[in-house]
């Protein structure tokens, strides 16, 4: 019994004056609480509690279920307790079969004993299966058996409390341990698409997937820089024991331009938080932006190949693409493909392959593209570089020698005189007249140059060379002179093409 200091309130005293009392099933339990300020008796076992306002607690025929802690409390809130075991060979355990354990914490298998004198109070696996090697426990006849530091691997473990009675092992009813996992990492969050592009009035719907070990993970959709609560719908699944998935779907049924912005899916647990964002861009109407990938002014040599290449952004998807030259549409030699296979791709590539270009194929090549909202076009001006071609070389009636050459870039015509029979003409002759003529062909065709010299300046036999050249190459034509006495014979022109 507690010792009492004079003047201080003291706890009640209980008769019989023991901490533990063992009675047989069917016998009487009589407990007396002595205290001038007696208030009540309380009985506790497992989740059950009973009260009694009489200072004497009497149970005429004790049952195993009367096993438990009896506490007497006075008006000062001071109390004293006695633990009563009601020994019943037919019911060695009192059992609360609910068994939950938090990972890494201790949990109590609640199977208190009705007889403290049995031996080997412990846990056993069901159907003779061994317990996990690392499972440690501490038995307490009044409370049950404490499993230390519960592991995730113990989830769904089936076990019994066990004692030895008269040399035989007796098992309690079975317990199934349900382990509540501890959060050892932040939730895993992902979003159905990283960016969305919509026209006004279209529905915006985005799904965030949250994965964690249990359903107690918290998640929400937030709009960056806004406190507005967003409307979201949830679906969730348990894929096995510690694999929980939630899908949080955010919907704006008719998106407006001012709904554009960054939306964040946020999730947290006791370990930490994670988030993922998606960007919404709402445009009032669709668009097409074309970007040339080569210079829009193209110079290419006669007979060579060149690709006219554009990249373009189109939203919504492009519906019609075409390449046009001289009002004719190309049916082949071109291709159009998405820049990436990404579902949210809006960038495309179009290529027109011009092969073995001829001098006559210079001009404006136009790429046109349209979608349901807009049309767009881009033009390439293609110039085909060609070696000069001497179109005419004549002696005119006024005694002039005339040379007309065509090519691109514009040819330069030089004149040379070779006296006698020499093949190499080095003495240059200044032209009397040089003109660039308007070509009858397309504006991107060859440029025509006409140059004339006065043949009366030549007093000796020889050859006059008209040489037309540009960056691509050169071509020559020759006029032969022959004098008989003072008369100049008919001039014979001939050409020699020089690569």
């Amino acid at each position: 019994q507690p010792s009492v200091s004079p003047g201080e309130p003291s706890p009640p005293s209980i008769h019989p004056g023991k901490s533990d009392l063992i009675v047989r099933v069917g016998d009487e339990i009589r407990l007396l609480c002595t205290d001038p300020g007696f208030v009540k008796w309380t009985f506790e076992i497992l989740d059950e509690t009973n009260e009694n306002k009489q200072n004497e607690w009497i149970t005429e025929k004790a049952e195993a279920t009367n096993t438990g802690k009896y506490t007497c409390t006075n008006k000062h809130g001071l109390s004293n307790s006695i633990y009563v075991f009601v020994r019943d060979p037919a019911k060695l355990f009192l059992v609360d079969r609910s068994l939950y354990g938090k990972e890494d914490n201790d949990t109590l298998v609640r199977c208190p004993l009705t007889d403290p004198e049995v031996t080997n109070y412990s846990l056993k696996g069901c159907q003779g299966k061994p317990l996990p090697k690392d499972l440690r426990f501490i038995p307490d006849p009044k409370a049950g058996i404490m499993i230390k530091s519960v592991k995730r691997a113990y989830h769904r473990l089936c076990l019994h409390c066990s004692v030895d009675q008269e040399g035989k092992s007796v098992l309690s009813e079975k317990f199934i341990l349900k382990v509540r996992p501890a959060f050892k990492a932040v939730p895993v969050v992902s979003v159905s698409k990283a960016s969305y592009l919509l026209r006004e009035g279209e529905e915006f719907t985005v799904t965030c997937t949250i994965k964690d070990v249990s359903s107690s993970v918290y998640s929400t959709w937030k709009r960056e820089n806004s406190q507005t609560k967003l409307q979201e719908k949830y679906n969730s699944w348990h894929h096995g024991d510690f694999n929980y998935e939630r899908q949080a779907t955010l919907t704006i049924s008719s998106a407006r331009v001012n709904d554009s912005g960054v939306f964040m899916c946020y999730a947290n647990n006791t370990f930490g938080s994670a988030n993922v964002t998606t960007t919404l861009e709402v445009v009032d109407k669709g668009f097409i932006n074309i970007f040339p990938m080569i210079n829009t002014t193209v110079f290419v040599n006669d007979g060579e190949n060149v690709d006219l290449i554009v990249e373009y952004e189109a939203f919504p998807k492009p519906e019609h693409q075409q390449w046009i030259y001289m009002n004719r549409t190309f049916t082949d030699k071109w291709e159009d493909y998405p820049k990436s296979e990404n579902e949210s791709n809006i960038r495309y590539v179009s290529e027109l392959h011009l092969t073995r270009l001829k001098g006559t194929e210079g001009g404006t090549y136009t790429f046109l593209v349209s979608n349901s909202d807009v049309n767009a076009a881009i033009a390439f001006n293609v110039y085909v570089n060609t070696k000069p071609e001497i179109l005419t070389y004549d002696r005119l009636v006024n005694g002039m020698l005339q040379c007309v050459a065509a090519g691109f870039p514009e040819p330069t015509i030089d004149w040379y005189f070779c006296p006698g029979t020499e093949q190499r003409c080095s003495a240059s002759v200044l032209p009397v007249d040089v003109q660039t003529l308007n070509s009858s062909g397309p504006p991107f065709g060859k440029l025509v140059v006409q140059s004339s010299i006065d043949s009366s300046a030549f007093k000796h036999n020889g050859t006059v060379e008209c040489k037309a050249y540009n960056d691509v190459g050169k071509t020559s034509a020759y006029f032969n002179f022959a004098f008989k006495g003072n008369n100049k014979e008919q001039i014979h022109p001939h050409t020699l093409f020089t690569p």
Epitope: F291, I294, N305, D307, W334, H353, T355
Partner: antibody, heavy 117, light 112 residues
Amino acid sequence: EVQLQQSGPELVKTGTSVKISCKASGYSFSNYYMHWVKQSHGKSLEWIGYISCFNGATTYNQKFRGKATFTVDTSSSTTYMQFNSLTSEDSAVYFCARRTAGAMDYWGQGTSVTVSS
Amino acid sequence: EVVVTQTPLSLPVSFGDQVSISCRSSQSLANSYGNTYLSWYLHKPGQSPQLLIYGISNRFSGVPDRFSGSGSGTEFTLEISTIKPEDLGMYYCLQGTHQPYTFGGGTKLEIK
């Protein structure tokens, strides 16, 4: 005459990076894409990607994304390829090549890169 | 990615022989516009590869007419009508329709 002149051989250390060049002449540089191709010793050719010589836009083979970086200097008609975080697997001959009509019509002479530890 | 398989790996020849090299792709090389970007290259030791044929059958400028290309869809062939010494080397086909572009494994043309 179209010519693609590449920089000389490189001997580099593991973990470093290398930048090789390809100087074009004989044609309108900005009218074409430049592609880069890898040939490991005794192996076939492998396409790395390409760059627009007009505006520097790039496309990479997924396998080389993050490993190769293309740049262009239009004033000198030169394209560059930088290879990062080099390992022995990157030891190879690298070619630049001009592309038209879905084919590579002119090639550089190749640049040998040897990665040593 | 499109896998391009070239056969044979090695082709021993005598000068004057006619030979063909096959190139097979794991999917059709014809795009939705009807274009097929299949080209052939000759790579001689110490030199850069040179384009022979583009667009299945178009000879590149300066390529002798003893070289010809044919095929469609997934099966393509390079033919050399009369082998000359300068034709020896490694031959590669390239598909330029689907990214990433892929080369065949190569065929070594060597003297018997």
